[in-house]
């Protein structure tokens, strides 16, 4: 379902960070995906093939993330603690035709108790 | 220079957790890079190509990473806090060949006052 | 409206080099792989060779593969294939083509490439 | 590397009649249900024209009398009834691999 569905869990924890999972259709072969807080987006993954079926994958804002064939999963690893946020993703399709944008459904996160967790000393 | 070298941050900050960066000449097309912690596997990412030269990326470990021509950076999210411990990279190039298998510059990572540092609420 | 003009064909010798341009306008270059096809006279289509977005991955066809090479200047909208140590067999139209995700679907005009001593 | 061949070389054709023109390709074009294959047209010293991706899916303002179909290895481009401005070549190609290859083209000539 392109629109998106609440069959999946948007949101799960790691220590210190979040990994935000956006879900499209198996029969989707090229794409835009982008991570939305509010208005801002804060990641952008575009997987594309060439005519010779070579895949090319851009990630302009360096996001960490996870590329499955049903998913872009984005990790954040110092979420907006100010407030309680509403985060969504935004899926271009290019390939199957024909082209089509849709916001999938997306989810509030809140955080508390937020603080610098650990410092880390590097000895190299 | 296949061995690695010391010009290039290996560990980088990120709240709650560290990427380790492991570096490879930007010639190598086709690699596996696997991520160590002393004699254990953390992660393994492998780059082929197919007969058509699509490109093929398997991570079989599930491992957060962001590859580039350069580099493969690895992000742990819950390194071990129990001691100091030394981090390194093995590379094994297939193309261009002759095989080869390197294990790549090392460093100590020591993790202090580590803690859970946030909970978070998630409403969907 | 979607435009693409190639320049910079010519006579050449053979085991000389030249450099095609291919002018882009009308959509975000960027966003595409860009592709070289070329046409013998009275022949049929031959692919070149690719390359994508940000010029990371680029494939050639075997008869040009060490002879050519594809580059683009995504701030000048425009992709290049340089032509080195050309052969007889090279002499073509080259057209610039859009890949537009399956289907080459903008092509340019051309520029004929002759290599003759 | 995928050899594409195309039959016939070229056909003589009058206003109305049925085109059937054919495409072969050396192994199978099938991948996750689509056929990686497609149909341009060439009219005499233009540049190459998109009609037909997917084996079977028009190209945006193409009419609707070019139909293409077929699947795995064996292609078909039809023009059901062929207008004086079909004249021209006609060439599939396949995106499956790398090289992406042509086949030899088929020529609309009038009779």
């Known amino acids: 379902e392109i629109n998106g569905s609440a069959d999946h869990r948007m949101f799960s924890f790691h220590n210190g960070g979040v990994q935000i999972s956006c879900k499209y259709p198996e029969t989707v072969q090229q794409l835009k995906m982008r991570l939305f807080r509010e208005r801002e987006v804060l990641c952008e993954l575009t997987k594309t093939k060439g005519s010779g079926n070579a895949v090319s994958i851009k990630n302009p804002m360096l996001c960490l993330y996870h590329l499955s064939n049903n998913s872009v999963s984005f990790f954040l690893n110092n979420p907006d603690s100010s407030q309680g946020s509403y985060y969504f993703c935004s899926l271009s399709i290019f390939d199957p035709p024909p082209f089509q944008e849709r916001n999938l459904s997306g989810g509030y996160l809140h955080i508390y108790e937020s603080q610098l967790c650990c410092q880390l000393k590097l000895w190299l | 220079e296949i061995n690695g070298s010391a010009d290039h941050r290996m560990f980088s900050f990120h709240n709650g957790g560290v990427q380790i960066s492991c570096k490879y000449p930007e010639t190598v097309q086709q690699l596996k890079m696997r991520l160590f912690r002393e004699r254990e596997v953390l992660c393994e990412l492998t780059k082929t190509k197919g007969s058509g030269n699509a490109v093929s990326i398997k991570n079989p470990m599930l491992c957060l990473y962001h590859l580039s021509n350069n580099s493969v950076s690895f992000f742990l999210n819950n390194p071990d806090s129990s001691q100091g411990s030394y981090y390194f990279c093995s590379l094994s190039i297939f193309d261009p060949p002759p095989f080869q298998e390197r294990n790549l510059s090392g460093g100590y990572l020591h993790i202090y006052e580590s803690q859970l540092c946030c909970q978070l609420k998630l409403w969907l | 409206e979607v435009q693409l003009v190639e320049s910079g064909g010519g006579l050449v010798k053979p085991g000389g080099s030249l450099k095609l341009s291919c002018a882009a306008s009308?959509?975000?270059?960027?966003?595409?792989?860009m592709d070289w096809v070329r046409q013998a006279p009275g022949k049929g289509l031959e692919w070149v060779g690719n390359?994508?977005?940000?010029?990371?991955?680029?494939n050639f066809a075997p008869s040009v593969k060490g002879r050519f090479t594809i580059s683009r200047d995504n701030a000048k909208n425009t992709l290049y294939l340089q032509m080195n140590s050309v052969k007889s067999e090279d002499t073509a139209t080259y057209y610039c083509?859009?890949?537009?995700?399956?289907?080459?679907?903008?092509w340019g005009q051309g520029t004929l490439v002759t290599v003759s001593s | 590397d995928i050899v594409m061949t195309q039959s016939p070389s070229s056909l003589a054709v009058s206003a109305g009649d049925k085109v059937t023109i054919n495409c072969k390709s050396s192994?199978?074009?099938?991948?996750?249900?689509?056929?990686?294959l497609i149909w341009y047209q060439q009219k005499t010293g233009q540049a190459p024209k998109l009609l037909i991706f997917?084996?079977?899916t028009r190209h945006t303002g193409v009419p609707d009398r070019f139909i293409g179909s077929g699947s795995g290895t064996d292609f078909t481009l039809t023009i059901t009834s062929f207008q004086t401005e079909d004249l021209g070549d006609y060439y599939c190609q396949h995106h499956y691999s790398s090289p992406p290859t042509f086949g030899p083209g088929t020529k609309l000539e009038i009779k």
């Open positions: 009308g959509f975000t270059f960027s966003d595409y792989w």
């Open positions: 390359i994508d977005h940000d010029g990371n991955i680029i």
């Open positions: 997917y084996a079977s």
């Open positions: 192994q199978s074009l099938l991948s996750s249900g689509y056929n990686y």
């Open positions: 083509a859009r890949w537009g995700h399956y289907a080459f679907d903008s």
